[in-house]
Amino acid sequence: EVEKTACPSGKKAREIDESLIFYKKWELEACVDAALLATQMDRVNAIPFTYEQLDVLKHKLDELYPQGYPESVIQHLGYLFLKMSPEDIRKWNVTSLETLKALLEVNKGHEMSPQVATLIDRFVKGRGQLDKDTLDTLTAFYPGYLCSLSPEELSSVPPSSIWAVRPQDLDTCDPRQLDVLYPKARLAFQNMNGSEYFVKIQSFLGGAPTEDLKALSQQNVSMDLATFMKLRTDAVLPLTVAEVQKLLGPHVEGLKAEERHRPVRDWILRQRQDDLDTLGLGLQG
């Protein structure tokens, strides 16, 4: 807290400019009018205020807007955003994607902070759903964003938004999350032809049921082992040896290297030895 002192003669700020960089904290408190600051927020980020000076500027805005900042101020916060607490952010109403992008840019290079998580939560709740543009923006800044959501939160993702999802965005998703995302992806990509469809749906297959895997096995997709190993065990178990052979194509030889790991191990144990022998891989059921 900066104590109240009178502004020295000739130091009253007429505008937010670089001369303020060399003001001490108490001078900023005494000589910068909060309303002036609010109307010239776009200049604040262009001026390299110090960490401690930004505390003073935040204090001024907090006094001016005790119920929360208006979006006209929020979109120009720049480095002041890093001074905000989740409690501050919960008072905001952020509706513009440009505002969201501007604030995420400030946090670039850092892990997702509680402030950013709160900001995103406020933004998405305000929109009512995770639309494609929002998802595009969030996954560009935080590739793991989608997998940080609960299955309940993922249920609000419309199928049209799935087009924005890249394979790496799903790297840390667990089966419960893929269970929610897979049907949406299936719907989103339903009008694509066989090989193109497989390229798009591949990352989501950890949520696919047995009947969809059986259907894929009829389409010469040549699924790689990495994708196969991420399939749900309960979806793989009912597949026949012939179906797995068709599903994997030339990659079927990779089963030998994975024979001790799920779901391959459990699938092998469900097959007749005669059928396994047709693969010529020496798999023992």
Epitope: A46, P48, F49, T50, Y51, Y79, L82, G109
Partner: nanobody
């Protein structure tokens, strides 16, 4: 937090030059403005120069034309080139990036 390490201080005669360097430990150095402060014995710490992440530089009135702040984001380093040094420039010089501070490097200007 970014770790900062200053170097380049020392004893120099009036009118001489020194170049201070401050190396940062993390790549996010380039996200922030960087500053040099100084503190003379018995005085308050003062901001000498600051450089925005865009490269715009600002200098305290009393050092303008003598001191120049610069940065090399690839090397995660901020510099302070000090020319025409005066006895009143004697102080411990500190590097600052966001909420991180260096340990300080002593600059003494004396004949």
């Amino acid at each position: 937090q970014v770790q900062l390490q200053e170097s380049g201080g020392g004893l120099v005669q009036p009118g001489g030059s020194l170049r201070l360097s401050c190396a940062a430990s993390e790549s996010i150095f380039s996200n922030y403005s960087a500053s040099w402060y100084r503190q003379a014995p018995g005085k308050q710490r003062e901001l000498v120069a600051t450089i925005a992440r865009t490269g715009s530089a600002f200098h305290l009135g009393s050092v303008k034309g003598r001191f120049t702040i610069s940065r090399d984001n690839a090397k995660r380093t901020v510099y302070l080139q000090m020319n025409s040094l005066l006895p009143e420039d004697t102080a411990v010089y500190y590097c600052n990036v966001w909420d991180s501070w260096g340990q300080g490097t002593q600059v003494t200007v004396s004949s």
